[in-house]
Amino acid sequence: SERCDDWGLDTMRQIQVFEDEPARIKCPLFEHFLKFNYSTAHSAGLTLIWYWTRQDRDLEEPINFRLPENRISKEKDVLWFRPTLLNDTGNYTCMLRNTTYCSKVAFPLEVVQKDSCFNSPMKLPVHKLYIEYGIQRITCPNVDGYFPSSVKPTITWYMGCYKIQNFNNVIPEGMNLSFLIALISNNGNYTCVVTYPENGRTFHLTRTLTVKVVGSPKNAVPPVIHSPNDHVVYEKEPGEELLIPCTVYFSFLMDSRNEVWWTIDGKKPDDITIDVTINESISHSRTEDETRTQILSIKKVTSEDLKRSYVCHARSAKGEVAKAAKVKQKVPAPRYTVELACGFGAT
């Protein structure tokens, strides 16, 4: 066959779906690779063709669209499974072509099993809730397009293994789950099971997400530098190792980039000739407030180094702060015999 623009296997779109549930999968060509949509392609006389390679096989084969009850079907640029089976796992290819044009992309589809606590190999989206912030909601994800608005599905919510009912601060409200006041104890996996009828059949959609309760913007502050501070003086003799920790606390801020850096005499360590190393460690509180420690280390400090200005800087979306370390050269203690001799006026 003639040349085809092959975008290869799009592993960025590792699609996971649950066994025995409907799945609608859009051809990635129109989402990520081509500058036109399916309608434009269709009206220009292009045809969308689907085929697949089974798991652990090399042979590409056409998808069987003649299964009982139309278990697999195509509608515009969507491949439908009603429902999936475990052995549907494999690499799927959608190809757009006519006599003069051809473009195709493959993507992996994994059909996974879940247990009765909704545990599975599925990668879970994370939804962050602010601690003690008033009413917040999560919505049952990725259910759009499965049934028309005229259908009234049933929705059951679970936390871990348990159906949510009579929970103190968590209230199921259809597709939404409301948290009256989010607490650390609300951390966990939440599952919605959506059940709906279609053409005389009944289908379930199971969606699990992880809820993480994080620091509230109401309590957020600019970075706080705990070290260096005015109480600690780094007093060294030439030849000793100089270690100065910079420890900074950052309040949790959604999508904020937290940064810590040292300057030596106003320059970044990379821009000066001193043999300096910086090691960073990061720890998080239960509400994802962050503590970053950057330890500045000079193995054999010189008297010149001890005269320099060492400043720790920190920045977040809440602001920027800086603090200088107090560094000085240790004055060598006079030798004991000399001191005594001087005291007695000896020559």
């Epitope: 247990d115 009765s116 009234k152 049933t154 293994c161």
Partner: antibody, heavy 117, light 107 residues
Framework: QVKLHQSGAELAKPGASVKMSCKAS????????IHWVKQRPGQGLEWIGY????????EYNQKFTDKATLSADKSSSTAYMQLSSLTSEDSAVYYC??????????WGQGTLVTVSA | NIVMTQSPKSMSMSVGERVTLSCKAS??????VSWFQQKPDQSPKLLIY???NRYTGVPDRFTGSGSATDFTLTISTVQAEDLADYHC?????????FGGGTKLEIK
């Protein structure tokens, strides 16, 4: 296809115990909760409780907490219900039911328990 | 516990007639009501879930409606094979509870 096959009828004396089984086939046993429902002759249905085979957790109707014990054996895809200290009030048909998303969609054929001196 | 009350206890209808069965909950159960059909010497079968959704394979002569505390199962044109007991149940909050049932007889 999904099937729940329940053990045969039981005739028991007052004060005795019985343990009935519900063997699942046609699906992954570990993926669904199993509920138990009681039906006295000519009467309505009564929910006893459920067992979650993954966690082993069972939730009971308070009325049955001292009467029924629910369990499951994943290796044989079988759910069990034990009834203790039997009285004539326990004479009934007992059903196991597979549930998902609040749908009591698949029922066993029932186990008849008769308590008689 | 939520009490589910069904009415009437029994009714006798002719083939082709319209049948309306009632189920009332003692508290608001939203849409979390299911209807079950139980033919003589058989297990119950799910007919309706979520108050109004027909389960797989259920003929469209069966229609569920209602919300909160008042629910109805309607058989638009009753057939001889519809002879059965009909149970409603709330699947809203533990303990799940069922009505006493309505026995439908065919004249």
């Amino acid at each position: 296809q999904v099937k729940l096959h329940q053990s045969g009828a039981e005739l028991a004396k007052p004060g005795a115990s019985v343990k009935m089984s519900c063997k699942a086939s046609g699906y992954t046993f570990n993926s669904y909760w199993i509920h138990w429902v009681k039906q006295r002759p000519g009467q309505g249905l009564e929910w006893i409780g459920y067992n979650n085979p993954t966690s082993g957790y069972s939730e009971y109707n308070q009325k049955f907490t001292d009467k029924a014990t629910l369990s499951a054996d994943k290796s044989s895809s079988t759910a069990y219900m034990q009834l203790s200290s039997l009285t004539s009030e326990d004479s009934a048909v007992y059903y196991c039911v597979r549930e998902y998303g609040d749908l009591f969609a698949y029922w066993g054929q029932g186990t008849l328990v008769t308590v008689s001196a | 516990n939520i009490v589910m009350t069904q009415s009437p206890k029994s009714m006798s209808m002719s083939v082709g007639e319209r049948v309306t069965l009632s189920c009332k909950a003692s508290e608001n159960v939203g849409y979390s009501v299911s209807w079950f059909q139980q033919k003589p010497d058989q297990s119950p079968k799910l007919l309706i879930y979520g108050a109004s959704n027909r389960y797989t394979g259920v003929p469209d002569r069966f229609t569920g409606s209602g919300s909160a505390t008042d629910f109805t199962l309607t058989i638009s044109t009753v057939q001889a094979e519809d002879l059965a007991d009909y149970h409603c149940g709330q699947i809203y909050i533990y303990p799940y509870t069922f009505g006493g049932g309505t026995k439908l007889e065919i004249k």
